[in-house]
């Protein structure tokens, strides 16, 4: 659900949504940590319809479910090199 | 005190279309997601759609997607659902409900339903 | 898809009972299952969200368990407008209900 991308792009989201998205309609999350051509961090959310959609990394709804995923993978060793994927 | 009267059902032959309605209040609607869920005759609950509180999202189960449509009209405190290719199968009372807080962050389930309407594919 | 295993089916039993129906889910959902009560002709109504928040108006002799896959919804004493059907809801991946439990008077 959870992935975490290390690239050498530039920023990929051109506007941010703070929209609710409850996490039953979300399939993936991806984030762009700030860095490697892009001054600032990305969340960029696939959802159950197909549709995608950038976060606003500072919207507590996507905080909340981020720190959820993150304290369920604390038991998973993490995945190797350029990518981080949370169950 | 929250409202959703369903209208439109009726008897509809295999293949064909029906579109129902939900009129909403006692809550401000454009705030809210909505979904309608069906039951079959005698049988359980099954979810058939969900639209988010601006209308820009929709979401559907495998076996009702492309031929259902869920869309809404926030000015008319309306709900619709248009039903193509119906089946037998789909016989069912159709409830609308009121779904999340779309203005919140709660992952709240649906929490009330109208009475429902119901829909009778024979031929 | 999720699947929602709800036991028993049906179940009778007598005013002031307690009552236990369980709702086993096919993978985690965390904590996001719901139950509804329904009565013959009328709107399912909800009871409980998030495993165990009771809504408002809603009688405490009503309460809801569990975690991951595993769920309980318990009647602590029996009343008679308690007899309907039960359902519980799935809301962690999508929407999914459980088949039912039919509670009649024994």
């Known amino acids: 659900v959870l992935e975490v991308y290390y690239t050498h792009l530039r920023c990929r989201c051109v506007q941010e949504s703070s929209v609710f998205i409850p996490r039953r309609f979300i399939d993936r999350i991806q984030i762009s940590p700030r860095g490697n051509g892009c001054p600032r961090k990305e969340i960029i959310v696939w959802k159950k319809n197909k549709s995608v959609v950038c976060v606003d990394p500072q919207a507590e709804w996507i905080q909340r479910i981020m720190e959820m995923l993150r304290k369920k993978s604390s038991s998973t060793p993490p995945v190797p090199v350029f990518k981080r994927k949370i169950p | 005190e929250v409202q959703l009267v369903e209208s439109g059902g009726g008897l509809v032959q295999p293949g064909g279309s029906l579109r129902l309605s939900c009129a909403a209040s006692?809550?401000?609607?454009?705030?809210?997601?909505m979904s309608w869920v069906r039951q079959a005759p005698g049988k359980g609950l099954e979810w058939v759609a969900t639209?988010?509180?601006?209308?820009?999202?929709?979401y559907y189960p495998d076996n009702v997607k492309g031929r259902f449509t869920i869309s809404r009209d926030n000015a008319k405190n309306s709900l619709y659902l248009q039903m193509n290719s119906l089946r037998a199968e789909d016989t069912a009372v159709y409830y609308c409900?009121?779904?999340?807080?779309?203005?919140?962050?709660?992952?709240?389930?649906?929490?009330?339903w109208g009475q429902g309407t119901l829909v009778t594919v024979s031929s | 898809d999720i699947q929602m295993t709800q036991s028993p089916s049906s179940l009778s039993a007598s005013v002031g009972d307690r009552v236990t129906i369980t709702c086993k889910a096919s993978?985690?959902?965390?904590?996001?299952i719901a139950w509804y009560q329904q009565k013959p002709g009328k709107a399912p109504k909800l009871l409980i969200h998030?495993?165990?928040t009771l809504q408002p108006g809603i009688p405490s002799r009503f309460s809801g368990s569990g975690s991951g896959t595993d769920f309980t919804f318990t009647i602590s004493s029996l009343q008679p407008e308690d007899f309907a059907t039960y359902y519980c809801?799935?809301?962690?991946?999508?929407?999914?209900f459980g088949g039912g439990t039919k509670l009649e008077i024994k």
């Open positions: 006692g809550f401000t609607f454009s705030s809210y997601a």
């Open positions: 639209i988010s509180e601006g209308g820009s999202d929709a």
């Open positions: 993978q985690d959902i965390n904590k996001y």
């Open positions: 809801l799935q809301y962690d991946n999508l929407y999914t």
């Open positions: 998030y495993t165990s």
């Open positions: 409900a009121r779904d999340y807080y779309g203005s919140g962050y709660e992952e709240s389930p649906m929490d009330y």
